[in-house]
Interface confidence: medium
């Protein structure tokens, strides 16, 4: 008997996983065990299956790939080099499949590959060269345009001893592969900060998200270099004023939009500068949201309707008279 | 017409091995991915294992795992099992059976069976 | 694993009567685009048989008095009228992830 046919345009097959580089490819219009396959729209979904690795038979036109809610655990070196490669791959999501361990090389041999998110993946060791795919101080350029590292920390106790946001920083930098990078979406990381050489070496991104993070405060990361940057998301932080330097970068950015809501500012004699910019500047958006945070007694007013007279310091007392 | 045919199967003593072998005619072997299923007597059906069309991808269930292979060789259209540490329960009558190379459809074909006993 | 839980596991019906087999699946087995849920027939000494695939769909060459319902986790075999040659044991099995496994079977016979 022969498959009949269905109104949708996937198909799919439904069996099952050993990883090897299969020399014979598969026929055109087959689908792997567990996914679903529109040659039409050229997806393959492998969606929420507890598949354990990258399934080996992945049809060749394959352009979109959703490889979520699975448990991969490992994405090794190669893990989506087949003969003849996918040479058309140009979406890639693994977001929510507990991958812990991202390898240098994972994502070769995808000549085509613009866009990956590897969001909600506790990445306990994300590889330098996980998207350079070579420990060369000058890799091949990356093709990825869109990169979506959105709440990958791991649980404290799985943390390697070592500065997570230094571990992603060096995936993102090694070997200048993301030079092309537009997109950059860092959510929900709990970054304290931001290492001051990261953006100096992305100089094509349109977009940064590091919303629903901990960065305390912006003031040795330089936005000078970003004159394509078009919206940062920093929404959900712990910012509690920018200073000067940092608001004279932003409003030289010529196509910027900023995104400030929900950080604790503190509404003190530091904050006189930054009150002045927003009153006259049109980058940030939802401006007339942003409320104080600290001192109590300036708590949620409004930024905008200060004056510096509502912007007092308490003088610093000689340690002689300070209290405990 | 569409033809699976175990055989292979037999008597064997606890810890010993065996090969069972499905022999595939009437449709293009290659094409398809193939299971081991089997039943032991008066029970249930137990999925084994699945080997895809080009060998590039296989599953097994736990109870087997490390110690079933399965196998096929396109060119003589002949899907294996090779069982390895057999135990008391695997004692059962094994089938081959087919799936579609693409859409979601469960096992069209089956074999008649061939029965494994393994016993002292 | 997901575990497949059948209901009666039999049932006696008249001839001519209708049959109704229940499969319950422990997760649900259907994307947005499908349902991988298979119904199978074994008569004594056989071979099990593809009776419906994917839920809904019958395979070819079985009679139309045979259906399947169905999405999620609850499925539904139904023989409209049942005939004497309808006498076996029916399965359901999904085909979500690995393994697959097979519901534990319901012995249909006439009353």
């Known amino acids: 008997s022969s498959p009949t046919s269905s109104a949708s345009s996937f198909s799919s097959s439904a069996p099952f996983l050993a990883s090897a580089v299969s020399a014979q490819p598969p026929l055109p219009d087959q689908c792997p065990a567990l996914c679903e396959c529109s040659e039409a729209a050229r997806t393959v979904k492998c969606v929420n299956r507890n598949l354990t690795e990258v399934p080996t038979d992945l049809p060749a036109y394959v352009r979109n790939l959703f490889l979520t809610g699975n448990q991969l655990a490992v994405l090794p070196a190669g893990a989506f080099a087949r003969r003849p490669p996918l040479a058309e791959l140009a979406a890639l999501n693994l977001s929510g499949s507990r991958l812990d361990e991202v390898r240098a090389g994972a994502f070769e041999h995808l000549p085509s590959l613009r866009q990956l998110d590897l969001s909600h993946n506790p990445l306990a060791d994300l590889s330098p060269f996980a998207f350079s795919g070579s420990n060369a101080s000058v890799s091949a350029p990356s093709p990825l345009v869109e990169l979506i590292l959105n709440h990958i920390v791991p649980p404290e106790d799985e943390r390697q001893n070592r500065s997570f946001e230094g571990m992603v920083v060096a995936a993102l930098l090694a070997g200048r592969a993301l030079q092309g990078l537009r997109r950059l979406e860092l959510a929900s990381n709990h970054f304290l900060y931001l290492p001051r050489d990261v953006l100096a070496q992305l100089p094509s991104l349109r977009h940064l998200d590091l919303s629903n993070n901990s960065l305390v405060s912006l003031t040795y990361v330089s936005f000078r270099n970003l004159t394509h940057l078009e919206s940062l998301h920093l929404e959900d932080n712990a910012l509690k004023v920018l200073h000067n330097g940092t608001l004279a970068e932003l409003q030289g950015l010529p196509h910027i939009r900023v995104f400030l809501d929900n950080n604790p500012w503190v509404c003190d004699c530091h904050m006189a500068d930054m009150v002045t910019w927003l009153k006259e500047t049109e980058v940030v958006q939802g401006k007339d949201r942003l409320t104080c945070a600290y001192p109590e007694k300036m708590r949620n007013r409004v930024l905008l309707e200060l004056n510096s007279a509502d912007l007092d310091c308490d003088p610093i007392l000689p340690p002689s008279l300070q209290t405990s | 017409e569409v033809q699976l045919v175990e055989s292979g199967g037999g008597v064997v003593q606890p810890g010993r091995s065996l090969r069972l072998s499905c022999a595939a005619s009437?449709?293009?072997?290659?094409?398809?991915?193939m299971h081991w299923v089997r039943q032991a007597p008066g029970k249930g059906l137990e999925w084994v294992a699945y080997i895809s069309s080009g060998s590039s991808t296989f599953y097994y269930a736990d109870s087997v795992k490390g110690r079933f292979t399965i196998s096929r060789d396109n060119s003589k259209n002949t899907l294996y099992l090779q069982m390895n540490s057999l135990r008391a329960e695997d004692t059962a009558v094994y089938y081959c059976a087919r799936s579609p190379a693409y859409y979601r459809y469960g096992l069209d074909y089956w074999g008649q069976g061939t029965t494994v006993t393994v016993s002292s | 694993d997901i575990v497949m839980t059948q209901s009666p596991d039999s049932l006696a019906v008249s001839l001519g009567e209708r049959a109704t087999i229940n499969c319950r699946a422990s997760?649900?087995?259907?994307?947005?685009?499908?349902?991988?849920m298979h119904w199978y027939q074994q008569k004594p000494g056989q071979p099990p048989k593809l009776l419906i695939k994917s839920s809904s769909n019958l395979e070819s060459g079985v009679p139309d008095r045979f259906s399947g319902s169905g999405s999620g986790t609850d499925f539904t075999l139904t023989i409209s009228s049942l005939q004497a040659e309808d006498v076996a044991v029916y399965y359901c099995?999904?085909?979500?992830?690995?393994?697959?496994?097979f519901g534990g079977g319901t012995k249909v016979e006439i009353k």
């Open positions: 099995q999904h085909s979500w992830e690995i393994p697959y496994t």
């Open positions: 009437g449709f293009t072997f290659s094409n398809f991915g």
């Open positions: 997760q649900s087995v259907s994307s947005s685009t499908f349902s991988y």
